[in-house]
């Protein structure tokens, strides 16, 4: 099942000359600290089935564990949203669902999971080594995605294990709001060291109650930079398209197509790695969203008439407020 | 006031295609969804899918796919929708609408109709 | 699809009376988050477009008279029109507008005596 990083437990020092209020003191920067590692980490899992009872029809789950309220959740298949993928069902949690074909049922398990349906026959079918991807926008984390396909040899009515394997970028209000918190956090943790550094420090002991359990790890900035861009797509496979991108609009297709750039980052690079590789979901730098190329007045590359620009589809008035209200 | 003004009735044979015009007024119109809803005496009021003008994003009921195209012209505020290979089940009024500001799918305003007969 | 029953297909009433039409969903319509039913009633006078009265169940668009209230929760829903007019001669339908693809009801047609 998910393998999640886990904190160790916290081991206060013997109680001594300090008495009850050095105690204390001792205390807070370990829980500040601990805050420190863990606070602005959400993760995203993915979970896709396939019926057993109909080899075209695909079931994906998909959950945010984060602290932040979720502002929209996007599923996507074959690559994701800004990267090739088309958008098979937007959820918005004050508006409704907006689904495109062959998604049949897109719903809220949760007020942090969602699900979504997948039945199709011909050009729109999902395929076996299809990839799915939902991305969560949320406040103040930002936006957060995560892909998964089933394994290559996976039977039919087998699931997929939910995969926490994000791809590391968050919006720049997700990392100003969350970094504010933290650079706070951290600053005040170090002035709190400073004036115990004369101290006998408290030891990180693992828990007692799962001493296998692994050590929570935070990444800094130029290391979650760098897996970004390492982190490698699943392969798509192109006949599993869905058939939205070719007859949308057979009378004078989007001319643009042929023209945009294309991001060497988003490429896929190899086959898929996303339901075995779980990768901790850790803050990055700001990667180039689908509002930022609609700014601009581009199109997201790859982006097919099933795709919408922005992160609410109801396009950049909606980021005004939480309705999109005028 | 926000307005929806469709192009007038239509007699088409057999086979044929047309193309159904819904202009809009009073609003900004690349920000607002614009559906198409058929009805018929005895079926009620059916989706047929819905635009988003300036974005090329549109969304079709599967049941209309191949049966409806939707453009939208931005620079005239108005919206589109083609009918190919048109029988008589196509006879029915068209209705453009627009999508609310509160919910993805409630309609707030919407065209006076378009009435389409397909006759031999 | 959310499939959308209305009962009954029509009624006659007289001026003054109190109206009340049903609307049943064929899965719940309530959302988790702002415990709202998305659900909307439109009237359609004859030989005209329908008009948005409620939405999310229970809320009136602007310009709608009170007497027109909206209720009902998850599946069941009804319209009531207290003090019905002559004016309110009309076909209503009830849809939802939680999910693709957005689904009516057949109608319920309203006649005065």
């Known amino acids: 099942m998910r393998t999640e990083a886990q904190v160790p437990a916290l081991q206060p020092p013997e109680p001594g000359l300090e008495g009850a209020m050095g105690h204390r003191t001792l205390v807070l920067p370990w829980v500040l600290l601990t805050l420190c590692v863990t606070a602005g980490t959400p993760e995203v899992w993915v979970q896709v089935r396939m019926e057993a009872t109909e080899l075209s029809s695909f079931t994906i789950r998909c959950g945010f564990l984060g602290s932040g309220s979720i502002s929209l959740v996007t599923v996507s298949w074959g690559g994701p949203n800004g990267a090739g993928g088309t958008t098979l069902a937007v959820l918005h949690p004050e508006r409704g669902i907006r689904q495109w074909a062959p998604a049949r049922q897109a719903r809220w398990e949760t007020q942090s999971s969602i699900s979504l349906i997948l039945e199709g026959s011909g050009a729109s079918s999902p395929c076996a080594n299809t990839t799915f991807c939902c991305k969560f926008a949320s406040f103040p984390e930002g936006s957060w995605e995560a892909c998964g396909s089933l394994p290559p040899s996976s039977d039919p009515g087998l699931s997929a294990p939910p995969t926490p394997a994000p791809i590391l970028r968050a919006d720049l209000a997700g990392i100003l709001g969350v970094s504010g918190v933290l650079l706070f956090g951290c600053v005040y943790l170090l002035h709190l060291l400073r004036r115990h550094k004369h101290r006998p420090a408290p030891r990180l002991q693992p828990s007692r109650t799962s001493p296998q359990a692994p050590r929570a790890r935070a990444w800094a900035p130029s290391q979650a930079s760098q897996a970004a861009l390492h982190v490698p797509y699943a392969t798509i496979n192109t006949s599993c398209r869905p058939a939205t991108l070719d007859t949308a609009h057979p009378h004078g297709g989007p001319s643009w197509w042929a023209s945009l750039p294309t991001h060497a980052a988003h490429r896929p690079q190899g086959p898929a790695a996303w339901a075995s590789t779980p990768i901790p979901a850790r803050g990055s730098f700001v990667s180039v969203e689908n509002g930022l190329y609609a700014q601009a007045g581009e199109r997201p590359p790859h982006t097919g008439p099933g795709l919408t620009l922005f992160p609410d589809p109801r396009g950049p008035r909606a980021m005004e407020g939480p309705l999109g209200v005028r | 006031q926000v307005q929806l003004q469709q192009s007038g009735a239509e007699l088409m044979k057999p086979g044929s295609s047309v193309n159904l015009s819904c202009k809009a007024t009073d609003y900004t119109f690349t920000d607002y969804w614009i559906n198409w809803v058929k009805q018929r005496p005895g079926h009620g009021l059916e989706w047929i899918g819905e635009?988003?003008?300036?974005?090329?994003?549109?969304n079709y009921n599967e049941k209309f796919r191949g049966k409806a195209t939707f453009t939208a012209d931005t620079s005239s505020n108005t919206a589109y929708m083609q009918l190919s290979s048109l029988t008589s089940e196509d006879s029915a009024v068209y209705f453009c609408?627009?999508?609310?500001?509160?919910?993805?799918?409630?309609?707030?305003?919407w065209g006076q109709g378009t009435s389409v007969t397909v006759s031999s | 699809d959310i499939v959308m029953t209305q009962s009954p297909s029509s009624l006659a009433m007289s001026v003054g009376q109190k109206v009340t039409m049903s609307c049943k969903s064929s899965q719940s319509l309530l959302n988790i988050f702002n415990q709202k039913n998305f659900l909307a009633w439109y009237q359609q006078k004859p030989g005209q477009s329908p008009k948005l009265l409620v939405y999310?169940?229970?809320t009136r668009e602007s310009g709608v008279p009170d007497r027109f209230i909206g209720s009902g929760s998850g599946t069941d829903f009804t319209l009531t029109i207290s003090n019905v007019q002559a004016e309110d001669l009309a076909d209503y339908f009830c849809q939802q507008h939680y999910s693709t693809p957005p689904t009516f009801g057949g109608g319920t047609k309203l006649e005065i005596k």
């Open positions: 609408a627009r999508g609310s500001d509160y919910s993805y799918y409630a309609m707030d305003y």
């Open positions: 635009i988003l003008p300036g974005s090329v994003t549109t």
């Open positions: 999310f169940a229970s």
